[in-house]
Interface confidence: low
């Protein structure tokens, strides 16, 4: 990495420090959007008093963005043109292409609970398909 990005207090997966993990992640679930458009990826951590130290947004194994309690937002350089922070701890994807179809993960790093992960599946549809109201569904 030729650039500096913030650290985060977690490593992925779940659990940490032997504490009881009571929290749950609510996500926007499976969503579809039109090619060329924008979409907001949103997660919400509830049912825990743990401190959120960082939220990571990942697409498969690629780091998209980090929102760090110490240092604020960092967008990975390869996504700077098409990813905007927010609203809140969410992430806005712009200028969508069909290649953006896939799984996205919000990874909440908390103290003392550990790591909570939410999953969103995004399908980017060709304009004509989206206009006819097609929706992605997991069978």
């Amino acid at each position: 990495y030729p650039y500096d990005v913030p650290d985060y207090a977690g490593g992925g997966g779940s659990g940490g420090g032997g504490s009881m993990m009571t929290g749950t992640i609510e996500t926007t679930g499976n969503i579809s959007a039109e090619k060329g458009g924008s979409i907001i990826l949103q997660c919400h951590l509830s049912s825990t008093t743990a401190q959120v130290t960082q939220v990571n947004w990942e697409q498969q194994d690629q780091l998209l963005a980090i929102c760090n309690a110490d240092l604020g937002w960092h967008i990975s350089p390869s996504f700077k043109d098409r990813v905007a922070p927010g609203p809140g701890l969410g992430l806005t994807l712009q200028s969508l292409t069909v290649n953006d179809t896939g799984e996205y993960f919000c990874i909440y790093h908390t103290a003392p609970d550990g790591t909570y992960t939410g999953r969103i599946f995004l399908e980017v549809l060709e304009s004509s398909v989206a206009e006819h109201g097609a929706r992605f569904q997991i069978p």
């Epitope: 500096d4 990005v5 977690g10 992925g12 997966g13 659990g15 130290t53 309690a69 240092l71």
Partner: antibody, heavy 119, light 107 residues
Framework: EVQLVESGGGLVQPGGSLRLSCAAS????????MHWVRQAPGKGLEWVAF????????YYADTVKGRFTISRDNAKNSLYLQMNSLRAEDTAVYYC????????????WGQGTMVTVSS | DIQMTQSPSSLSASVGDRVTITCRAS??????LAWYQQKPGKAPKLLIY???TLQSGVPSRFSGSGSGTDFTLTISSLQPEDFATYYC?????????FGGGTKVEIK
Amino acid sequence: EVQLVESGGGLVQPGGSLRLSCAASGFTFSNFGMHWVRQAPGKGLEWVAFISSGSSSIYYADTVKGRFTISRDNAKNSLYLQMNSLRAEDTAVYYCARMRLDYYAMDYWGQGTMVTVSS
Amino acid sequence: DIQMTQSPSSLSASVGDRVTITCRASKSISKYLAWYQQKPGKAPKLLIYSGSTLQSGVPSRFSGSGSGTDFTLTISSLQPEDFATYYCQQHNEYPWTFGGGTKVEIK
């Protein structure tokens, strides 16, 4: 070039105190989480403590909790480990290590400083 | 705490051999495992993180695989400079824990 240089080790009696320092250079220190890891003579590696870039997240191994304090001074590019109530089993080489940008793996390590606790 | 068990604890091999070291976690750590190489009197060196991602500057003869609880470090063709001790470390959760090490010696 990333460099981490530990200092402050030495011989101390049981119950005594030591303060280890780690001087960082060659990277933007204030953007990286940092670890202390130790290695007893002839033994394996043991993680000791972690501090996030802005010090908002601090974690300790159970074996040192309540006795050791990790801290950092980003203005001085320095990491510290204050060790109190030292025991014979704390005898080890102590390494400071930089956390990778994206995971808790440790991508750069110092050369280590030896701490010997003995009467 | 997650216990990391490495095997074997030591092995003897010759230059050019294919060497495999395994690491088992006491519970699932997803893909979050790192491998380090340490030579006598030196600091550890990161080889692989996140299970299979090669750290920059590490030769491609090193590779990592596995997820969940079982992981493998493979050296495809052992070189003279590879004789060392290798450690695995889970970076899934606090407290971060290391395996006991595997010493690779010259046969």
